[in-house]
């Protein structure tokens, strides 16, 4: 039950995180005009990964896309790439994790396969979250560098007569959305990995001990509550689970069914 809850919660948290990463990537407010200690402009500038916008105090907003690819800063391209990779990995992770959910039954999918898929999606979520956090952090670093550079020459003038308003940019809402979303995706991924450990039957550190009686043989399975007799098809076909624990001899007998990559 705890495993199902952990897996389900991990999925929901990751889903919210990936939705946030998508939202952050699409948002226009990655950097916004710094209003502190600046002249009160009747124009508010803000920029995203895909376009820059200007909102006039009249309420009119105009956005222009970055229609060039080669003319854009390499850092911006890198941030775009990181965010897209994060989204793609997260989307694949979500798809995989849907099938991995313990509460969803798909044909005769074994718990071992579900454990595999849970681990895979968990890793994907972790990488997705890291990509988003890295992308947002790279952009934030770029902003901080540019901010102090523009502060150094806040007013550039021609012989001190004509002043030009230097537009400084600070952190936009998208950065905070990205950081939070990346963190949630990361947490969701970790939860999926934890859930995977609970789903996967674990190997014990000792071999099963068989006691041979004169009439019939009984194999005592130290890991489980049940003991199966040596005759019939019972031993061959029945998998004995005890909270994910399994016996050594099962692994050796059926490598094709119970091997974990």
């Amino acid at each position: 039950m705890a495993v199902t809850a952990c897996q389900g919660l991990g999925f929901v948290v990751s889903l919210i995180g990936i939705a946030g990463i998508i939202a952050a990537t699409c948002m226009d407010q990655w950097s916004t005009q710094d209003l502190y200690n600046n002249p009160v402009t009747a124009v508010f500038n803000y920029q995203g990964l895909w376009r820059s916008c200007v909102r006039e105090s009249s309420g009119f907003t105009e956005c222009r896309g970055y229609f060039t690819l080669l003319g854009l800063p390499a850092m911006l391209q890198a941030v775009r790439a990181l965010m897209i990779v994060g989204i793609v990995l997260g989307a694949i992770g979500l798809l995989v994790s849907i099938f991995a959910l313990k509460c969803i039954r798909i044909g005769s999918m074994e718990d071992s396969a579900k454990a595999n898929m849970t681990l895979t999606s968990g890793i994907m979520f972790i990488v997705s979250g890291l990509c988003a956090i890295a992308g947002v952090s790279v952009f934030a670093n770029m902003l901080v560098t540019n901010f102090w550079m523009s502060t150094a020459n806040m007013y550039t003038g021609m012989g001190g007569m004509v002043q030009t308003v230097q537009t400084r940019y600070t952190f936009g809402a998208a950065l905070f959305v990205g950081w939070v979303a990346g963190g949630l995706t990361l947490i969701g991924g970790v939860m999926m990995c934890i859930a995977c450990r609970g789903l996967a039957p674990e190997e014990t550190n000792y071999k099963a001990v068989s006691y041979h009686a004169s009439g019939h043989s009984v194999a005592y399975k130290p890991g489980g509550f049940k003991a199966s007799t040596g005759f019939g098809s019972n031993t061959k076909n029945k998998k004995i689970y005890d909270g994910g624990a399994r016996t050594e001899d099962e692994v050796q007998s059926y490598p094709s069914k119970h091997d974990y990559v």
Epitope: A42, V43, N45, S58, G59, R64, V165
Partner: antibody, heavy 118, light 113 residues
Framework: QVQLVESGGGLVKPGGSLRLSCAAS????????MSWIRQAPGKGLEWVAT????????YYLDSVKGRFTISRDNAKNSLYLQMNSLRAEDTAVYYC???????????WGQGTLVTVSS | DIVMTQSPLSLPVTPGEPASISCRSS????????????LTWYLQKPGQSPQLLIY???TRESGVPDRFSGSGSGTDFTLKISRVEAEDVGVYYC?????????FGQGTKLEIK
Amino acid sequence: QVQLVESGGGLVKPGGSLRLSCAASGFAFSSSAMSWIRQAPGKGLEWVATMTVGYIYTYYLDSVKGRFTISRDNAKNSLYLQMNSLRAEDTAVYYCARQGYGNAMDYWGQGTLVTVSS
Amino acid sequence: DIVMTQSPLSLPVTPGEPASISCRSSQSLLNSGNQKNYLTWYLQKPGQSPQLLIYWASTRESGVPDRFSGSGSGTDFTLKISRVEAEDVGVYYCQNNYIYPLTFGQGTKLEIK
């Protein structure tokens, strides 16, 4: 068509108060920034105050800050200018205007005269 | 505050002749975000309210005759009337629409000779 009609002007003693109103019609008032501009007799235009869309920001001329208050009632399609502690130099025709592209005042009212005299 | 300086303050013109009014701002009105100049031109005809002619320094307001044109960038701007007509008389104002307070120029009075 767009119409802006100012009212509330008149003669007032120095230190007195007056409330100007501007009734708007013919456009989406709630999604438009509105301004008050004044013109002293025989003088040029002087911007007084602006209220942006959604009550977010209000801006004032330094000499009227703390004395004048711009407000709006979107339900009534009306803009207001509450003027307190009036001075002789506040005597002017007060225009109500809508801000359009480029923050330009694209539509103006006919104006209302405010006279501050003892 | 941005100071807007217009010249000349008075402009007598013969009908059919061109006219030019200059406006200079103490700070640049160019916004780096959209590369637009936040300068506006108005005409106030005698006994009337002002009317918008040009915004963004060079964009003509709808309904404004094409004999009116605006140019300039940064701090220096010009309003040109290709052929002055009798109905063009009045006071022309330039306005800073970039930084609050939204200051106006002193005005240029255009009159027919």
